[in-house]
Structure formats: structure tokens, C-alpha cells
Amino acid sequence: MAQWNQLQQLDTRYLEQLHQLYSDSFPMELRQFLAPWIESQDWAYAASKESHATLVFHNLLGEIDQQYSRFLQESNVLYQHNLRRIKQFLQSRYLEKPMEIARIVARCLWEESRLLQTAATAAQQGGQANHPTAAVVTEKQQMLEQHLQDVRKRVQDLEQKMKVVENLQDDFDFNYKTLKSQGDMQDLNGNNQSVTRQKMQQLEQMLTALDQMRRSIVSELAGLLSAMEYVQKTLTDEELADWKRRQQIACIGGPPNICLDRLENWITSLAESQLQTRQQIKKLEELQQKVSYKGDPIVQHRPMLEERIVELFRNLMKSAFVVERQPCMPMHPDRPLVIKTGVQFTTKVRLLVKFPELNYQLKIKVCIDKDSGDVAALRGSRKFNILGTNTKVMNMEESNNGSLSAEFKHLTLREQRCGNGGRANCDASLIVTEELHLITFETEVYHQGLKIDLETHSLPVVVISNICQMPNAWASILWYNMLTNNPKNVNFFTKPPIGTWDQVAEVLSWQFSSTTKRGLSIEQLTTLAEKLLGPGVNYSGCQITWAKFCKENMAGKGFSFWVWLDNIIDLVKKYILALWNEGYIMGFISKERERAILSTKPPGTFLLRFSESSKEGGVTFTWVEKDISGKTQIQSVEPYTKQQLNNMSFAEIIMGYKIMDATNILVSPLVYLYPDIPKEEAFGKYCRPESQEHPEADPGSAAPYLKTKFICVTPTTCSNTIDLPMSPRTLDSLMQFGNNGEGAEPSAGGQFESLTFDMELTSECATSPM
């Protein structure tokens, strides 16, 4: 099926992203009208070779002509009009630079395929993004259910056979002892001889039948153990491993993990079957002790069967001991696996073998870096002690689903102080936020005469001593869990692996979607890819090093990509969350793209984006205006940082933003949020009604107070250069009587005239340049 057709069938949330891909520079109608032809061309090659680009561009115009004549025959006036308009636009814009249109189309096609990929992945995960605990059963899981059912049935069948073989053996034993006690075996004289011989034959026959049944049971047990081994392998190496991988993904903001209940049911069922089978093998030993003979299959095979079932059960119990909730500080629920010394963190372990007889029997002990002595790369790492309640008894009462678990709620880490400032020795090769530590949970199970040592551990955690280390610590957690499913590679950062853009893009989007209602669009991700990798057409498969992601400064900047992005994430969550959720913030958009989409729009159209130069995270708006000569100008205001947004909401800044022109007239340059949403419609609901700003006048005063309103104003002159960011200043106290205040200007009346000149221009709203 053609790519374009596949795209049409996607969910609304993906279609929204698709809409964001297309603009006037490459209209969606054109993509629709010429879908098969567009998909058959090599745009990436055209984007890199001018001669080929020219050829493809001329062919494109030819295709448009052909399509136009089709519409002519169909008398489709609207489509004819649109196509003519598109062709004129393309000629005027790309005739001289055909490589540019090739680049745009190539990128769109790549982004489309990426979108399809994302949708397909989400579908494979059974829509977990929407329904984290939904019981979506895959074909593989249905097979697993069937195998488990088969195991249970075979165990029950064997139970029956064991009863039958026991009956047969008891009957044989009875007959053997009867014959022996009567002395019939020796007394072969006279009349008794033929009767005794007959009975002897019957007895031999019974022994043959007993031997056959024993062999059959031993053989069936061996087959059953193989079936159990297969199911167990599927459960632990696939289902449980999948769950653990999904837990890693969920930890770094990906789709929430499915709950463990179904897996617990499966594992418990298998464990029950294994214990029943172990009893059956024990029963064989009893039978063998009562009756044995030369070539007895029980003597031959029982020890090996016993060994296998114990090994299987032991391994199942060990695998079933999991960290259900990874260590996390309650104050930072969206950033698990980063622990600050002295701050409480919580974690929860669970045994997926739900045996009531184990309730209150298992005492869990927690420790940190249990095996660190063996790890060469950890020389020089800091060492920690766990403080707080570090032992807990597993029980079924604390959890609401009756699972056998232990939740540790009051753990803290304290660094072991050494003479050299805390580091165990001076040759520490890793910075503290790259140092990985493991929290280990241990217990012993005594069950049906077996002693099993259980041990599990958290995913690697990063331990920080100051909250300012959080961004880099979180970057380490992202990089680790994005690139490995090895649960305990504490040496990971001695030689950190390289990630691909596709992996990084997904994780970056999760950083937004996990704490807001909106991830990153393809357009936004492409802009981020450009920042990390430089200009390009297809970023898929491009490699990104750990250093480039988090350690090296970006070109021409004094800070790394991750520090910049993390501050923007923080800015979004704390200051502009509602606007982000609405999709009003374009956020990440290159200057070229910004110019391209705004230049065709009417004056007053504006968009909101993040500052590229503000380390602390800044948000700005860019708008279209016409200069005196009628020429389109694109203007940006100096970015607003958290500092300014603390004092005034961004919605209010936008609603009140003014330019003071050369004649001291206040003008609002922001009219329509791109593409064409009236400003009031978008932001009005996020501003306090003026009546609420000063609800009461001082009851002691005769006259009510004059209301004041803070607004941001940019003083501008005719020489204001295009694209230079304008520095907003707060017009401190613009007095308002009734509804007059917003448009106050010198000619509005005497009292306003003096007011205008007396306005106090406070310090700038933002200090860092764009």
C-alpha cells in the first residue's frame, strides 16, 4: 500500500503530527494529488545533486499539468484552481533553487515513514500508551496460556496414573506376600501345582504391567519436565524480560508498563504444577522402597528427575523475585533511579509466586553495591550506607491486589566519608553522575524442605549530593535505559555506547509526553536533530555519542544540548504547561522554517518558540509585521525566562504585549496565533479577569483605588532591524479607568498625556539575548 494511503488510516493523534509536517512551502494538496509519483522519486539524491534536482522539479511541474488536465475533464473547478495556484507558487519559489524543494519533500517523506513506524510500534505494544494495564493478549501469550494449561492437564493425568500404579503395586504386593506366606511357591506338589503355576504367571504378568506403568510414568515425567522447562523459559526469558524492558522504558518516560498480575498468575500456576510434580517424584521413591526389582526404572531415573524439578523450581523462584517499583524519591516521581543523599526514597519488591503459605515468611534485606568489591571499574567510586528501615517482611496485606510484596518507604543513602573527600580513592575515572550503583534485595525461602536464596536488584541508580546534579544524573539514566537491557552493567559509562537519532528522538519525546499531555511532533524533533547533528535531510540512523548528547557544549554555546533541553522541559512543566498541552507552543522550530511559515501569513500572526541561546530555558514569540514601505518583517521578542514568568504568566504577557512606536503609541503586534487562532481565543481563558486582580478597595478610603495593570512593552524605532530580538520592558503602572486603559495614547486626553511621559520603565523582562 502506498505510504500516503497508510498515513490516512492512522489515529487522529498521528494525523495531527502529519498536519504539522505540511505548510505552504510544500502544500498537502500537492502531496495528496501526486502521491504515487512523489513516492516513486529519489528526493534525497535530488537534494544533494543540483542537476538531478532540476530534472525532478521540471518533471514535478509536468505531473501537475497532467493532473490539472484530469481535473479539467472532471470539471473539478476547486481542484483546478488549487493546482494552478500551487504551480505558480512552486515556480516563483523554487525555479532558481530546485534543491530546496527536493530537500523539503525528502524530509517530509522521511518524517512520514517515521510516523508510520511509531504508530506500528504503538500498535504492537497493544495500545499500552492508552491502556497501561489493559489485558491485551498477544498470539504468543495465548500460546503460553495453552502450554500452561497443557502442563496443568499433564500433571493431573499423572496424578491419576500415580494412583493407578499405586493400586496395581499394592495388589501385586498383596498377591506376592499372600503366595509367599502360604508357602505356595515351594509347594508345587499334587493338585496345587497347576493352580500355583497359574497364580505365578498372573503375578509375573502383574509385575510386567507394573514395570510398564512405571516406565510410562517416568517417561511422562521427563516429558512434562521438558514442557515445564519450555514454558519457564518463555515466561522468564521472554515475558518477564519484556516486562523488565518495559519497566526500563516506563522509568524514562515511555509508555506505562503493564501490570504484573497476569505474569504472576502464570508463574504461580507453573510453580504449583512444579511442586505437585515434585510430590509425584517423591511418591515414586516411596513406591520404589515398597517394591523394587531388577531394571526398576524408578531406581534408574528418579534421582535425575528430582534434580531437574528442584532446579526448575529454584530458578523459577529466583526469577520471580522482582523489583516492582524502582527506587524513586517521592518528590521526583517522574525521575526515578536518581537518589539524593539524605533524601528519602521508596522502592518495592514482589515475589511473583503467590503462595499463601509464604505470607509473612520472607524477610527482605536491602543493601547497596553488594558486589562492588568485585568490580574493577568501580575503583574510585563513592561508597554508601543505606539508612532507615532496611529490612521488611513480605506480606499480602499491604498491596491492594494481594500480591506478595514488600514496600520500603523510608530509605536514605549516606555517603561513607573517606579521607580524600568522599571518593574511595583518587583515580576515579567517572564523574559522580556517571557512577552507577545497585540496590540489592535479599531473602531466603524455606519451602517443602528446600532452602532457596533469593536476590534481585534495582536498575542502576545515580546518587547525587546536590539537586543541581539532577539534570546530568537524569541524562545518565536516560542513556543507560535507552541503550541497554543489561540490568546491572555498572561499568556502562566507562565506555558509553552510541545511540541513534531514532532512539534519542523517541526518548526526548517521552520527556514531554510523560509529564505533559503532549509529546514532540516530527517537526519539533527534526529541529532538535538539527541542533544535535547539524543540517541534514534524513537523520534516521545518525549516530549520537554520549558526549554530544550531554557533555560537550553545542556549537557556539556555553552549554550542552541536554542542559538546554532539560531547562526547557522544566520551563514547560512549571510555567507554560497549559499552553503546551493545548499545542499552542511550536517550541522547537528553526529560524528558516519560522520565516518560511510566517512570511506568507497576514501581519499580526505570531508563534511561540523556545530560545536557542538561553541556557536556563526561555520562551519567545515571533510575529509578522509590515514596515512603513509595506515590506513583510519577522520580529522576535527577547526570550522570557523562568525569572520573569514567576512574576507574570506567559498568557498574560502575550495578551498584554505592546510595541511603543516612534510616536509613543502603544500597539499590540500579536493578533493571531499561527496559523489563524485569534489571540483572545487561545490565551484569554488563561488570564485572570481584571475584576479579580484587585477585588477590594480599601474600605477606609473615600474613592476607590485606580486599577493598575502590568504589561510588557517594546520601545521601537524606525531603525529597528529585521529579526533582531526586541527587548521587552514592563510598563509598570498603566492606569486604567473602565476599559480605556489598554489603548492609552498621548492624544487620548490630558490626564493620559502626562501619564505616558511619567511611565516608569522597569528593568528588562529578559536579560539573555536570543
Epitope: 493407578v164 493400586n167 498377591n175 499372600t178
Partner: nanobody, 126 residues
């Protein structure tokens, strides 16, 4: 459950012999034969316990019929000699898990579950 499959029935002349066979799906302590003539109640014919290898017979067949078992094949046989017209009936193979299968079982007064076959028809012409 125990499945029982009978064979060997058919038409015989009075005074002739016939051998009925029954194979069980698994071992049981007690196996035997019952019969039901048209318009009459089902009655016990012969039974053999796995303990003591002792056969039990209803009076009307004693000395003429003989019951035996093959423990390897999980089979029971009824050797019918000097067949009489009153032996004509549907013959059912029966089994139970316990080993007690004397007169009480044949009289159908014993407790416990009995498994039945589908039956094999014996007709006797004089």
C-alpha cells in the same frame, strides 16, 4: 475415567462356545461381566479381583463360564462354554477401582463407582 471396549459377541448355537474380550484404558482392581436380556434387569455374571486372583460367578454360569485377566493388556475375558438359550443377552464389561468384587458387586449392592462398556450382543439359537 476408565474407558471399556467389548468385543467377541455374536450368534452361536446352543451348546457351543464363545469368548468375549474387554480392554480397559487403564488398570483397575476389579473387572467383570454383567448381562441384560430384553425385558429383564441387568445381572452380574462373573468378576475377577486383582487380589488373590479369585473369580466370582453367578450360580447359573458356574462350571460353564470362566473369567480371566491379562494385566499387561488391561484386558478381561469371559470364556462361555456350553451356551444355553437363556444366556442370550447384551453383555456389558464393567470395572471398578477398588479390588473388592465378590458377590456384593455382582449383586450390584457394593458401594463405589462402576465404569461400563457399551455392550456386546450374544444371541443363542436352539
Amino acid at each position: 475415567d476408565v474407558q471399556l471396549v467389548e468385543s467377541g459377541g455374536g450368534s452361536v448355537q446352543a451348546g457351543d462356545s464363545l469368548r468375549l474380550s474387554c480392554v480397559a484404558s487403564t488398570y483397575t482392581g476389579c473387572m467383570g461381566w454383567f448381562r441384560q436380556a430384553p425385558g429383564k434387569e441387568r445381572e452380574g455374571v462373573a468378576a475377577l479381583s486383582s487380589r488373590g486372583f479369585a473369580g466370582h460367578y453367578t450360580d447359573s454360569v458356574k462350571g460353564r463360564f470362566s473369567i480371566s485377566r491379562d494385566y499387561v493388556k488391561n484386558a478381561v475375558y469371559l470364556q462361555m462354554n456350553t451356551v444355553k438359550p437363556e444366556d442370550a443377552a447384551m453383555y456389558y464389561c464393567a470395572a471398578r477401582e477398588g479390588w473388592e468384587c465378590g458377590e456384593t458387586w455382582l449383586d450390584r449392592t457394593a458401594g463405589g463407582h462402576t465404569y461400563w462398556g457399551q455392550g456386546t450382543l450374544v444371541t443363542v439359537s436352539s
